[in-house]
């Protein structure tokens, strides 16, 4: 806290500039007026305060909007936005995708922050929803942002805005945020053909039924084992050899390579023996010959 | 986290030149702005020169006398004095804050001492 006390003769701030920087803290309190501050935000960030600086500036615009900020000031924080705490960005109300971007690139390359996550909770929040225009500047400026959203959350997510997502910002998603996207992304990309369509849906294949993996298995697509390894194993353990070898292509000569590792080793085991030795992969572990196969899932629903 | 180390003070006559150094270490990338300030014994620290970007700032004390630069290859700043009076007499620190962390990092001090 700055103690109160007179401004030097001589030194009352006329207006934000660069002389400014020379001043000790106590003449920032004394001789600027906050008044002055918020009609010449635009020009702080032009100006090398100190962290410390800014502090006093903060403490300013906190006693002259004791509400929260108004846009007007908040489009304009500049590097002031990182002195912000999380309670001081709960009392904003940010409605410019301008603003927003604005304060996203203070912090641009570096790890979303406390006060990062809540200004786009905020902005996001008095949208309603994930609109095409946020989504693209989120996932700009934070690769991982969509993985970062509950499955409740990106429900709101609009079909459309899946446009804006490219492959690298599903990297850290579970498989819990794919079972969410993936029937979005299906609608998104519907009237695509094939190829196309396969190339804008492979990232969220995650979160794919077996019927639409058995669709794909016809459609020569090629997947890479990458891709297949990340499917849900309750998705993949109903694919017959023939379809998987169809959908791989010839990336299915990567099973052998995978054989241990789930959805493979399960689906492996699922598989008659005879089936997988077609492959001529020497994949191990299948039902041997003569062996009876019952589906006690099935029997169960028919209980 | 930034280390800063200077270098380059020493004793000079009065109108004599010395040029002192910073060199920059760590998170480098994230430096958003650098400074000297020079402290006088029993006084406050003084900011003397900034740079921020492409633009200089300096004291009135020091105007026209003092150039700051900095060479981003080598993470080097500099601070070259010219017509150095015995008033220049101080620790000379060097300081960098930093874009994500919101931080203030600074060096060790170099002494300048300049005789009449």
């Known amino acids: 806290e700055v103690e109160k006390t007179a401004c030097p003769s001589g030194k009352k701030a006329r207006e934000i500039d660069e002389s400014l920087i020379f001043y000790k803290k106590w003449e920032l309190e004394a001789c600027v007026d906050a008044a002055l501050l918020a009609t010449q935000m635009d020009r702080v960030n032009a100006i090398p305060f100190t962290y410390e600086q800014l502090d006093v500036l903060k403490h300013k615009l906190d006693e002259l909007y004791p509400q929260g900020y108004p846009e007007s000031v908040i489009q304009h924080l500049g590097y002031l936005f990182l002195k912000m705490s999380p309670e001081d960005i709960r009392k904003w109300n940010v409605t410019s995708l301008e603003t927003l971007k604005a304060l996203l690139e203070v912090n641009k390359g570096h790890e979303m922050s406390p006060q990062v996550a809540t200004l786009i909770d905020r902005f996001v929040k008095g949208r309603g929803q994930l609109d095409k225009d946020t989504l693209d500047t989120l996932t700009a400026f934070y690769p991982g942002y969509l993985c970062s959203l509950s499955p409740e959350e990106l429900s709101s997510v609009p079909p459309s805005s899946i446009w804006a997502v490219r492959p690298q910002d599903l990297d850290t998603c579970d498989p819990r945020q794919l079972d969410v996207l993936y029937p979005k992304a299906r609608l998104a990309f519907q009237n695509m053909n094939g190829s196309e369509y396969f190339v804008k849906i492979q990232s969220f294949l995650g979160g794919a039924p077996t019927e639409d993996l058995k669709a794909l298995s016809q459609q020569n697509v090629s997947m890479d084992l990458a891709t297949f390894m990340k499917l849900r194993t309750d998705a993949v353990l109903p694919l017959t050899v023939a379809e998987v070898q169809k959908l791989l292509g010839p990336h299915v000569e990567g099973l052998k390579a995978e054989e241990r590792h789930r959805p493979v080793r399960d689906w492996i085991l699922r598989q008659r023996q005879d089936d997988l030795d077609t492959l001529g992969l020497g994949l191990q572990g299948g039902i041997p010959n003569g062996y009876l196969v019952l589906d006690l899932s099935m029997q169960e629903a028919l209980s | 986290q930034v280390q800063l180390v200077e270098s380059g003070g020493g004793v000079v006559q009065a109108g004599g030149s010395l040029t002192l150094s910073c060199a920059a270490s760590?998170?480098?990338?994230?430096?958003?702005?650098m400074r000297w300030y020079r402290q006088a014994p029993g006084t406050e620290r003084d900011l003397v020169a900034v740079i921020y970007g492409s633009s200089t700032y300096y004291a009135d004390a020091v105007k026209g006398r003092f150039t700051i630069s900095r060479d981003n290859s080598k993470n080097t700043l500099y601070l070259q004095m010219n017509s150095l009076r015995a008033e220049d007499t101080a620790v000379y620190y060097c300081?960098?804050?930093?874009?994500?962390?919101?931080?203030?990092?600074w060096g060790q001090g170099t002494l300048v001492t300049v005789s009449s």
């Open positions: 300081n960098a804050d930093t874009i994500g962390t919101a931080r203030d990092y």
């Open positions: 760590g998170s480098t990338f994230s430096i958003r702005a």
